[in-house]
């Protein structure tokens, strides 16, 4: 299953598949997913080790039990890869890293005023993967705010060093944030030309692409197809780059064919795993073990819930059959492609499933009319689980926020639905950050149920928590996405960046906003909390956020919309906008619903109707 | 310029037989996975059969297994269905399709013939 | 197998409209997804392969976009010989299935 959690002074002992420089644990565990062996990963932050040629070391494992011994070591981070791990797999990595120069071929030098410019330069060229920025007041004056487009053979730095006034981070392509845009079509009998950088065995051109899309080099590819007059060569799938991005030629050949990654798509990335069925195929590989299974499909499952598994040839010979089940042949390679590929066979074969991140059905735990005052425009994808609760009458309007759990629920404040009940007259968006890109032709989600906590009451701020089962579930990519939930009872964890967001008003009498909103908001103590509401009180099932000061806040049409921490990487949803005194004034908190204290409530209502639950413990 | 042609349809008694042909130009025939899809009389359409391109490997719609028989001749250029036990719920215009790339099974159809009308009844 | 359920099942527009149909499949086929156009009396023409393909030959009118369960055909702008019934279709495994069609009428 999945495990997400991290193991602090700890490393693995042994399992090396391959290292590298990473800027943090994060981007460490995201290169292990994606590593067709790695299980574990072991990273050593710059603080942890005198040897300078191991800072910010990312040591990818494998483990044919899945674990590894872990010795002590001071400031090591380790932890497991995210392969089924459903939603969590991601490619994205946004971070920008401050007093980090991460090295690489500098190919590209520009002046720009900001490392935001300088990371959206690098996300529109098609070559760069990472990029560094000297600020303005960087000791050199000559190199203040250059912008340094990078690329290396493996797509991570080939070394990181601590540097005052540079700031790194990178590419965002793998977000679908470029603007280049992507060639969608597949050419037919036609090779390209240029530098090879990876040859694969693949059973079709469209999993070539995917694989073409996720390695960090390839820019297009050809794939020689399974009646190539050469027949050591069938099914290569050939990964190439060049120096222009683009092929600089392109031959007419029968049986090959051509085509481009998908990197550099706008909004829309394929999945990095392959779904598809290959009847009269075998896969050829490293056997990992054989089971008899009652169906194709069920042996593509058993491969996806074997985590080493890689891909799998489900055989119907007679002498692999017996009753109703046949041998199912779970394999792996080194690379994570099929060693030789068969045809005409009385098997079927496919993929593991265990990077796809449509994940199971599940949502994600781990083991008074409140907009946000004093915020900054989100970007797209930045919160991929807020989502819009319109309601249209005649006209339609914005009401809240909420939250996407799962394929099909959305976790919002109860007062929502304050004399608003009907589940017909919502409509609810997802994937969206401007309200003014809603048109007639936007597709929405409608409301199967609402489920408004028993104990809530109109008017009291107690309970004002509800969950509401959309008609369909809706499918996960980049930019719709759920949060994960806390633990039961979570209140160990000490959250220090906490973040509000939503459309609402940005004063007190103000107006709905078109761009999402954000704004980071330290959490209160509920003894401070109660100190600043005393006609009011603030129980142990309530969290509370915001400045002395005042200045920031969420405020009228944020209700029912998140509160998220980030804590070891990961985002939680820790409260639901709920309450507060106006908004963003001095000494009064924005009051917020306690999500880790209605665990075991969301737990039951998001039960199947086979009684099976819909949640999933990454833990 | 890819052309595909079928003939063999007509109307045949329930419990009887016919063989459908399709003969195909205007590109490498043997290099392509090829399809009979259906579509019965103001209905949607239906997979029916597939065949890869050496002729090696078939599939078959649960509702026609063990009654139809895919078939090419890639000296011929030509796809087969052969149909026998013929049902009332087989009427229906039969398209030949050919694979849209040249791979084991694409499952996309870029090219399909004018079709052929099987009448089955008493 | 794998069910695949269009929706509207027909649609009445003017020419120059945006027509949006969408396809649902009853379980993720990732991007194995086509639609195909047919007018009366004549055989399926394939528009869009693997959900936003563009068939050669097609104007670029028509694009696909969709991943997993729920996929979209889209015709920009309505032209008279966009009039037909239109298909969506799973090649993610056998058996191959596909909608039961969407009519575009003319209001």
């Known amino acids: 299953g999945c495990l997400t959690q991290l193991y602090e002074n700890a490393f693995f002992r042994g399992g090396d598949v391959a290292s590298m420089y990473t800027p943090n644990a994060q981007y460490c565990q995201m290169r292990c997913t994606f590593h067709p062996r790695c299980l574990l990963f072991s990273f050593l932050p710059a603080s942890s080790i005198n040897d300078m040629e191991k800072r910010f070391g990312c040591f990818l494992k494998d483990s044919v039990t899945g674990t590894l011994p872990k010795v002590h070591r001071t400031g090591a981070v380790s932890g497991h890869s995210l392969k089924q791990c459903g939603h969590q797999i991601s490619a994205c990595h946004r971070d920008i890293y401050k007093g980090v120069d991460m090295r690489g071929v500098n190919f590209n030098v520009s002046k720009v005023s900001s490392v935001e410019e300088c990371q959206k330069r690098c996300t529109s060229n098609i070559r760069c993967q990472f990029f560094s920025y000297a600020t303005q007041t960087f000791h050199k004056a000559e190199y203040r705010n250059n912008c340094l487009l990078k690329y290396s053979p493996g797509g991570t730095p080939t070394a990181i060093k601590v540097l005052s006034n540079v700031e790194s981070g990178f590419s965002l392509k793998p977000c679908a944030l470029s603007e280049i845009g992507c060639h969608m079509n597949i050419f037919q009998h036609l090779a390209f030309s240029d530098v090879d950088v990876a040859r694969v065995l693949t059973p079709d051109a469209f999993v070539c692409r995917t694989i073409c899309t996720y390695h960090p080099n390839c820019l297009f590819f050809t794939f020689y197809t399974n009646v190539w007059k050469i027949e050591s060569q069938r099914n290569v799938c050939l990964l190439k780059t060049s120096e222009s991005g683009t092929p600089s030629s392109s031959t007419p050949q029968e049986n090959t064919i051509s085509g481009y990654s998908l990197l550099t798509c706008k909004r829309t990335l394929p999945e990095p795993c392959h779904s598809k069925i290959y009847p009269g195929v075998d896969f050829g590989g490293e056997e990992l073990n054989v089971t008899f299974v009652k169906g194709v499909n069920v042996c593509q499952e058993t491969c996806t819930k074997m985590i080493r598994c890689q891909f799998f040839t489900y055989s119907l010979l007679p002498e692999d059959c017996k009753e109703e089940k046949c041998k199912c042949f779970l394999r792996l390679s080194m690379d994570g492609s099929p060693t030789r590929i068969a045809y005409g066979t009385q098997g079927s074969s496919g993929y593991s499933l265990r990077l796809c991140n449509t994940g199971d059905n599940s949502v994600c735990t781990t083991k008074t009319s409140t907009r946000i005052v004093g915020g900054t425009n989100s970007s797209w994808g930045e919160w991929p689980w807020q989502v819009s609760l319109q309601v249209k009458l005649t006209a339609q309007r914005h009401l809240c926020g909420g939250s996407l759990i799962g394929h099909q629920w959305v976790l919002t404040a109860a007062h929502c639905f304050d004399g608003l009940p009907l589940q017909d007259v919502w409509r609810i968006y997802s994937g969206i950050l401007n309200l003014s890109d809603i048109t007639k032709d936007t597709p929405f989600s409608q409301i199967k149920e609402i489920i408004i906590h028993q104990n809530y009451k109109v008017s009291e701020g107690n309970h004002d928590i509800a969950l509401i089962k959309l008609q369909a579930p809706l499918n996960y990519t980049e930019f719709q996405k759920p949060i994960c939930l806390p633990s039961k009872g979570d209140t160990s964890t000490i959250y220090t960046n906490c973040w509000v967001t939503g459309w609402g008003f940005s004063k007190e009498k103000g107006e709905i906003q078109n761009i999402l909103q954000k704004v980071n908001i330290p959490l209160v103590t509920n003894e401070e909390c109660q100190k600043r509401y005393q006609d009011y009180k603030i129980t142990q099932r309530m969290v509370c956020a915001g400045y002395k000061e005042g200045g920031k806040d969420a405020c009228k049409g944020d209700s029912g919309g998140p509160l998220v921490c980030k804590h070891n990487g990961m985002w939680r949803l820790v409260g639901i906008t709920s309450w507060g005194e106006g908004c963003a004034r001095r000494e009064q908190p924005g009051v917020y619903t306690k999500v880790a204290e209605y665990m075991d409530w969301i737990l039951e209502k998001t039960q199947s109707s086979d009684g099976k639950a819909q949640m999933q413990s990454p833990a | 310029e890819v052309q595909l042609l079928e003939s063999g349809g007509g109307l045949v008694q329930p419990g009887g037989s016919l063989r459908l042909s399709c003969a195909a130009s205007?590109?490498?025939?043997?290099?392509?996975?090829m399809y009979w899809v259906r579509q019965a009389p103001g209905k949607g359409l239906e997979w029916v059969s597939s065949?890869?391109?050496?002729?090696?490997?078939?599939l078959y719609a649960d509702s026609v297994k063990g009654r139809f028989t895919i078939s090419r001749d890639n000296s011929k250029n030509t796809l087969y269905l052969q149909m026998n036990s013929l049902r009332a719920e087989d009427t229906a215009v039969y398209y030949c399709?050919?694979?849209?790339?040249?791979?084991?099974?694409?499952?996309?159809?870029?090219?399909w013939g004018q079709g052929t009308l099987v009448t089955v009844s008493s | 197998d794998i069910q695949m359920t269009q929706s509207p099942s027909s649609v009445s527009a003017s020419v120059g409209d945006r027509v949006t149909i969408t396809c649902r499949a009853s379980?993720?086929?990732?991007?194995?997804l086509a639609w195909y156009q047919q007018k009366p009396g004549k055989a399926p023409k394939l528009l869009i392969y693997?959900?936003?393909g563009l068939q050669s030959g097609v104007p670029s009118r028509f694009s696909g976009s969709g991943s997993g369960t729920d996929f979209t055909l889209t015709i920009s702008s309505l032209q008279p010989e966009d009039f037909a019934t239109y298909y969506c279709?799973?090649?993610?495994?056998?058996?191959?299935?596909f909608g039961g069609g969407t009519r575009v009428e003319i209001k």
């Open positions: 379980q993720g086929i990732s991007s194995w």
């Open positions: 279709q799973q090649a993610k495994s056998f058996p191959l299935t």
């Open positions: 399709a050919k694979d849209h790339l040249s791979s084991w099974y694409g499952g996309f159809f870029d090219y």
């Open positions: 693997a959900t936003s």
């Open positions: 065949i890869v391109p050496s002729g090696g490997h078939t």
């Open positions: 205007g590109f490498t025939f043997s290099d392509y996975t």
